[in-house]
Each structure stands twice: as C-alpha cells, then as structure tokens.
C-alpha cells in the first residue's frame, strides 16, 4: 500500500476503561493531529478505518464489528464498546484515507478491573477544593455522549465502599456532589456510578476521582521569607564554610509557579566567579502550602566573599519579596601579653563574635542540587 502519515503510538493518551462498562473512544487524529474535524474529512470523501493489535501480539487485525448485540461499533469518529471485555486491551489504530491521502495514529487502550469498593489500577484525576471556602462542587467526569439528554440516568455517589447518604457537609445532587464547606477530612476518593438504560439493557459508568482539600485563596499571602532574617548574623573567618539557608513559605495558589533564587552582588550565582553550591528542598503542608529552602554554600569563603551582598528572592502569583543575609568577617580576638616580670596586668574583656548558623532540616519531599562556578 502507498505511504501513510504515521503518527506512531500516542502514549500520551493512555486510555483506561473499566471492564464490563460502555466506553466511547474518539479517534485522536481529529483532536490532536489534524487541523480539520471528522465532518470535514467525511464530506471530503475520506474514510475512517479502525484496527487493533492485541496485548502481547504484533499482528494488526481488523476490529470485528459483527459481534452479538453490536458489542463493538463505530459511529462517526467514535469507537464504541457496549460493554468492554478484559481482552479488549491492546493498541488501537484509526486511519483516515482515500486514494490520495492517508494519516493514522495508534493509542493504547487498557481494560481495567475494579473491586467492590472501586479500587483499581486506574489513574485518578485530582480535584482540588478550597478549605472552608463555601459551597463547591465536583461533577461526575467523562459521561457526556453516553446517553441522549432524554434519558434520565440514576447517579449514586460513593466514598470508598459506601454510598454517601448522610455525610454532614457533603450532599449528592445528581451528577454533582456538593461540599457545603470543605475540610481536610473530606480528602479521599469519590466515585459516581451512573446507571442508564439502552435498548432494553442497563449499563453502568463508574468514575472515581480524588478530592484534595487545599489552602483557600482567601487566606493566600505573598511569599514569606523566614530566613535570612534580622536576628541571624553569619560571621565567618576566611577559609571556613559559609552556609546560608533561604527558607520561604508559599500559600497554596492554584496554578501558581513558586520560585526562590539567590543573588550575589545583584547577580545570579552562575555569573559570579566563585564556587557556590545551592541545594533546594521542598515540603508541603496538608493543604499544599509549600516551604522551599535553598541553602547557599561556599566551601572555603574568602574575605572578598564576606564583603558581598547575599540576597534571597521569592516570587509567586501573589507577589515578589527579597531579603538580604547579614554576612560579616569574624574579627580575630586581640592577643594580650603581660609586660615586665611581676606586673599585675589589668582585667581585659575579650569579646568573641558569636557564630550563628541556622539549618533547616527534616521531612522534605524533593531535593535538587545546583553547583555554580
């Protein structure tokens, strides 16, 4: 056969569906690869062809559209399973072609089993709710197109093995689950089961999502730099190691990028001709507020380095802040000698500057390591 534009196996669309449930799978060509839709292609005389490769096989084979009760069918750019079976798992290909044009893409379909409490290997979408924010809703996802609007399905909401019936602040309202006020205790997996009739048969759609209660925008503040601060002075002698932590608290903000960085004499450490290492660690609170710590380290500090300006900067969608560390060269204590043989030598106060270092530790989720010269 003549050449075909092959988009390969689109692993970005790892489609997972439950065993023994209906599944409608759109050909990804029109969604992600081509600049025209199915209707345009069809009216231009292009035909959509489906075939598949079974799991652990290399052989491409046509899809059997002549199964009892039309278990597998095609409608426009959608491949329908009514319902799926476990051995439908495999790589599916949709190919759009006529005598002069050909384009195809493959995608993996995994038919997944669940237990009586809806546990399964299915990857779950996460829905974030703001803590103590007022009424918020989650909606039973990915059920559009399964039944016409004239059909009134029954929807049952579960948390784990059990139906949600009298769950204080959580109220099932058809396709929606309303949280009158969300608390940390509302974290967890919620499942909607949609039951609808079709041609004398009853089908079930099971959809599980994870609810994560996060910090409210009402309480969000600009980044807060806990360290460096005015109470800590970094006094070093040349040759010693200089360690300065920059510890910043970020309120949870949806889709905000939190950044922390150091400047030395107004420049990025990359642009300074000294041997600087920066280690970053990140930890999260239960409501996904974030604490980032970047420890700036100079192994053998010089007297020149101790005269530089070290500034920690932080930025989020709420604003940008900066704080300079107080770095000083330790003054060596003067040496006093007793002159003459029997002199009494007066009482001398010897002040030694105190070395103060504060090191943020413990329980971090991520670690990054940067080395600058």
């Amino acid at each position: 056969s003549e050449r075909c534009d092959d988009w390969g196996l689109d692993t970005m669309r790892q489609i997972q569906v439950f065993e023994d449930e209906p599944a409608r799978i759109k050909c990804p060509l029109f969604e992600h690869f081509l600049k025209f839709n199915y209707s345009t292609a069809h009216s231009a005389g292009l035909t959509l062809i489906w075939y598949w490769t079974r799991q652990d096989r290399d052989l491409e084979e046509p899809i059997n559209f002549r199964l009892p009760e039309n278990r597998i069918s095609k409608e426009k750019d959608v491949l329908w399973f009514r319902p799926t079976l476990l051995n439908d798992t495999g790589n599916y290909t949709c190919m759009l072609r006529n005598t002069t044009y050909c384009s195809k893409v493959a995608f993996p379909l995994e038919v997944v089993q669940k237990d009586s409490c809806f546990n399964s290997p299915m990857k779950l979408p996460v829905h974030k709710l703001y803590i103590e924010y007022g009424i918020q809703r989650i909606t039973c996802p990915n059920v559009d197109g399964y039944f016409p609007s004239s059909v009134k399905p029954t929807i049952t909401w579960y948390m784990g093995c059990y139906k949600i019936q009298n769950f204080n602040n959580v109220i099932p309202e058809g396709m929606n689950l309303s949280f009158l006020i969300a608390f940390i205790s509302n974290n967890g997996n919620y499942t909607c089961v949609v039951t609808y009739p079709e041609n004398g048969r009853t089908f079930h759609l099971t959809r599980t999502l994870t609810v994560k209660v996060v910090g409210s925008p009402k309480n969000a503040v600009p980044p807060v730099i806990h360290s460096p601060n005015d109470h800590v002075v970094y006094e070093k002698e040349p040759g010693e190691e200089l360690l300065i932590p920059c510890t910043v608290y970020f309120s949870f903000l949806m889709d905000s990028r939190n950044e922390v960085w150091w400047t030395i004499d107004g420049k990025k450490p990359d642009d300074i001709p000294i041997d600087v290492t920066i280690n970053e660690s990140i930890s999260h609170s239960r409501t996904e507020d974030e604490t980032r710590t970047q420890i700036l380290s100079i192994k053998k500090v010089t007297s020149e380095d101790l005269k530089r300006s070290y500034v920690c900067h932080a930025r989020s969608a709420k604003g940008e802040v900066a704080k300079a560390a107080t770095v000083k060269q330790k003054v060596p204590a003067p040496r006093y000698t007793v002159e003459g043989g029997g002199g009494t030598g007066g009482l001398n106060d010897i002040f030694e500057a105190q070395k103060i270092e504060w090191h943020e530790g413990g329980g971090h989720h991520h670690h990054h390591h940067h080395h600058h010269h």
């Epitope: 089993q113 237990d115 009586s116 409490c117 784990g160 093995c161 059990y162 019936q165 205790s185």
Partner: antibody
C-alpha cells in the same frame, strides 16, 4: 493501637431480637467502616453487612436484608448490629471487624459475641 | 453471589514442612482476595490481601498467589503456631463471601 470491644454473650428466644455492640478505639471512628461477620458453631465465616459511620451509609448481604440493622453512634465510637426474628440457626459467634472505608478486607477484629437462640 | 471453595478441608502437615492451601472462586474475582487465619476461640486474623500482599506484621513464610478463579496460600515452613483454620474471602463483588475453611493440623 486499634481495638474493638464487643458486648457480652446473649441467650435469646426464637422470634425475639438481639443487639450486639462494638466499641472502637484508636483512629477516627468516622473515617472507618465496621463490618459484621458471623460464624455458626463449627462453620465458616459469613459477612452480614457493614456501616461507614461518617457517611451515614450501610450495606447488607441479601440474605440478611430486612432482618439485620447496623447502626453507629459517633459520639461513643460504637457500632451496633441488631438481628430480628431470631431462629435457632442464628446461633453463632458474631464478630465486628474494622478497616478503611476504601478496603474490603478486614484488618482488625473484635473478640466475638456468642448469641444462643434457644426456646 | 460468588461461591468460594477451599481444598482440602483438612491438611495434615509436620512442623517444618510446606503447606499449600487452595481457594477457587465460582467466577473471576481478579486479585480481590484475602486470606485469614483463625485459631480455636479466637477471632480471625488478616494474613494476605490483594491475593499476594502480606498484611502488617505477618511473617514472610506466608505467601499468596493466583488471580481470576484460582488462588493459593503457601506456608513455606510450618511453625507450631501456624496450626489453625484458614479462610479465603473475595471482595470483588457484593456480598463479600468466604470459603468454608481449610484446617491445617499436625501430622
């Protein structure tokens, strides 16, 4: 340390009801599920039903539907199983068992309550 | 409901020997199976869930395998405290159902 402590043995007449309690300690009562499982003398285990106190929700095995009622009192972290219209074949040890509302296996068990139905 | 059938009803084994217990489901339960141990006068104790995952504090000599309709509990080297009755439980479908049990006794 999770503990489930059940009420004491009961002797009941046929046709009457029995209510067995199960007091839970350790962990948040409302975030768990309590199942009831019975075992007739010399027999195997039989799941009767369960409750998720925090969700106000119960599930029952078809066999016991209409005859068993499972309730919970969150203020005292206690679950109850009431079985009505008792017959001699209901003579058994009744266990409560607890786990997460997400898991269908039973990790923590009470010591059991023997219910004897005899005229 | 799913019927769980265990075999043999009784297994006579000497201490230190291997014991293999079987559990069969009347229809596929995927890997949604648990094993429990029960000693006389005691409540059952969870050994295995997910067909092969050992519960907290369960010694490594206990192992579970299988999926679909055929499952096995293996005790690699029987200790005196392992002589008991063992039950399988499916939780793929409601109602959850148990096998009738296998008694492991000293030979």
């Amino acid at each position: 340390q999770v503990q489930l402590v059940q009420s004491g043995a009961e002797v009941k007449k046929p046709g009457s009801s029995v209510k067995v309690s199960c007091k839970a300690s350790g962990g948040h009562f409302s975030q768990f599920a309590i199942s009831w499982v019975r075992q007739a003398p010399g027999q195997g285990l039989e799941w009767m039903g369960g409750i998720a106190p925090g969700l106000g929700s119960t599930r029952y095995a078809q066999k016991f539907q209409g005859r068993v009622t499972i309730t919970a009192d969150e203020s005292t972290s206690t679950a109850y199983m009431e079985l009505s219209s008792l017959r001699s074949e209901d003579t058994a040890v009744y266990y409560c068992a607890r786990d997460s509302i997400y898991s269908a296996w039973l990790a923590y068990w009470g010591q059991g309550t023997l219910v004897t139905v005899s005229s | 409901e799913i019927v769980m059938t265990q075999s043999p009803a009784t297994l006579s084994v000497s201490p230190g020997e291997r014991a293999t217990l079987s559990c069969r489901a009347s229809q596929s339960v995927s890997s949604n199976l648990a094993w429990y141990q029960q000693k006389p006068g005691q409540a059952p104790r969870l050994l295995i869930y997910g067909a092969s995952t050992r519960a907290t504090g369960i010694p490594a000599r206990f192992s579970g395998s299988g999926s679909g309709t055929e499952f096995t509990l293996t005790i690699s080297s029987l200790q005196s405290e392992d002589f008991a009755v063992y039950y399988c439980q499916q939780y793929n479908n409601w109602p959850w159902t148990f096998g009738q049990g296998t008694k492991v006794e000293i030979k």
